[in-house]
Interface confidence: low
Amino acid sequence: SEVEYRAEVGQNAYLPCFYTPAAPGNLVPVCWGKGACPVFECGNVVLRTDERDVNYWTSRYWLNGDFRKGDVSLTIENVTLADSGIYCCRIQIPGIMNDEKFNLKLVIKPAKVTPAPTRQRDFTAAFPRMLTTRGHGPAETQTLGSLPDINLTQISTLANELRDSRLANDLRDSGATIRIG
C-alpha cells in the first residue's frame, strides 16, 4: 500500500524519495508522475531528471533537495484539492526491469483558516528549515561513462508522514532501504 502524506490547501506538499549514487556524478534518471507507477516510465509526468540535469519540470513542481546526492524529493507548491492522489517516484536504474518504483499518496485537506497569499509566504513559514537541510540545484553536466556499471548501493523512500517534522537526513535513514546487486 502507498505511504500517505498530508498537506493543507494553499501550502506546499513534500513527497520524499531518495537514492544513493554509487559515486558522485553517477546519476540515475528519475521521473515523477501523477498516478500510480505503470509498468514502464511515469504517467502524467510532472518532473524528470536525466543523467545530467533536470530536463523537464512544470511550474509548481520542483526538487527541494540536492539531487546530485540522490535527493529527488518532490515539492508541490500551493496545493489544491485537485492535487490529491497517488504520485509515482520512479528511479530508472539501467538494465531490464531494474527500476525502483515508489507510490506515494498525497491527501490534501481543506485549510483550517484562510491562508495569506502563498506567493507572499516565506517558504520557511510553511515548511521549517528542518525539512530543507540541503540545497537544491541541477545535476552536473559532465560527460558520464556507460551507465550499467553504476551499481547503486541504496534506494530508499520514506515511510514517515511529513508532519513528523524530522530532519530530512533522519527521515532518509528511517526509510525503506533496498540494496542492489
Epitope: 506546499n12 519540470w57 512544470t58 546530485r68 507548491e77 500551493n78 517558504f123 540545497g135 540545484g137
Partner: antibody, heavy 121, light 110 residues
C-alpha cells in the same frame, strides 16, 4: 529572445514605499524562478530576493526581510517587488534577473537593465 | 561587507591569462557545486559567464573557465582581450537557501 524590463524606480523619502515591476517576455515565465538583485552606487551586486516559478516560495536577504515583498503575476508575465519602510541604504539600481531553471542554486542567465531607486530626504 | 571575498582588482596583458579568486566558507562556496560568475561592463547589466562552478553559459567563449577547490572558486580568463576589461563577480548559493555575491573584482587589461 529573453527580455526583462524594470520600472517603478524613483526618488522616495526615508520610511516611504515603492513598487518595482519587471515585465518579462521571450520565455515561459511560469517555469522559471526569478530574483531581484541590487547595486548601490559604486558598489558590488547584492542579492535581494527570489521567488519560485510557482510563486509559492520566496526568500529574502536579511537586510530587507520584513520590509520587502516579492511576488509574481504569471498571467501578466510580471515580477513585482513591494518595498516598504525604505532606508537610505536601499538606494541602488535594482535588477530583475531570471534563473536558469526553477532551482535556487542556479545562476542568473538573463538580466534587465535596472531601475534606479533613491532614498533621500 | 561581503561574506565572499574577491580581490578588488587584477590586471593582465593582452594575450595572457589572469585568474580571479573567490574565497568563501563551507556554507556558501564550499557547500556544493553552485558557484556562478558574472561580467559587468561599465553602465551595463551583469552577464552570466559560468554556472555550476565550471559550465560556460550559452555563447561564452572557452577563454573563460571556472574551477573550485574547497572553499575557493576561481575564474580564469586566457588570451586576454581589451574588451575583457570589466568588473567580475562570483556568486554562490548558500546552505540557508539564500544567495551571496562576492565583492567584485575589476580586471584591467594593460
Amino acid at each position: 529572445q529573453v527580455q526583462l524590463q524594470e520600472s517603478g524606480g524613483g526618488l522616495v523619502q526615508p520610511g516611504g514605499s515603492l513598487t518595482l515591476s519587471c515585465a518579462a517576455s521571450g520565455f515561459f515565465f511560469s517555469s522559471y524562478a526569478m530574483s531581484w538583485v541590487r547595486q548601490a552606487p559604486g558598489k558590488g551586486l547584492e542579492w535581494v530576493s527570489s521567488i519560485s516559478a510557482g510563486g509559492g516560495t520566496s526568500y529574502y536577504a536579511d537586510s530587507v526581510k520584513g520590509r520587502f515583498t516579492i511576488s509574481r503575476d504569471s498571467a501578466k508575465n510580471t515580477l513585482v517587488l513591494q518595498m516598504n519602510s525604505l532606508k537610505p541604504e536601499d538606494t541602488a539600481v535594482y535588477y530583475c534577473a531570471k534563473k536558469r531553471q526553477n532551482f535556487w542554486s542556479e545562476g542568473y542567465d538573463s538580466w534587465g537593465q535596472g531601475t534606479q531607486v533613491t532614498v533621500s530626504s | 561587507h561581503s561574506a565572499v571575498t574577491q580581490p578588488p582588482s587584477v590586471s593582465g596583458s593582452p594575450g595572457k591569462a589572469v585568474t580571479i579568486s573567490c574565497v568563501g566558507s563551507s556554507s556558501d562556496v564550499g557547500y556544493g557545486d553552485y558557484v556562478s560568475w558574472y561580467q559587468q561592463l561599465p553602465g551595463m547589466a551583469p552577464k552570466l559567464l559560468i554556472y555550476d562552478v565550471e559550465k560556460r553559459a550559452s555563447g561564452i567563449p572557452d577563454r573563460f573557465s571556472g574551477s573550485k577547490s574547497g572553499n575557493t572558486a576561481s575564474l580564469t580568463i586566457s588570451g586576454l582581450q581589451s574588451e575583457d576589461e570589466a568588473d567580475y563577480y562570483c556568486a554562490s548559493y548558500r546552505s540557508d537557501s539564500n544567495f551571496v555575491f562576492g565583492g567584485g573584482t575589476h580586471l584591467a587589461v594593460l
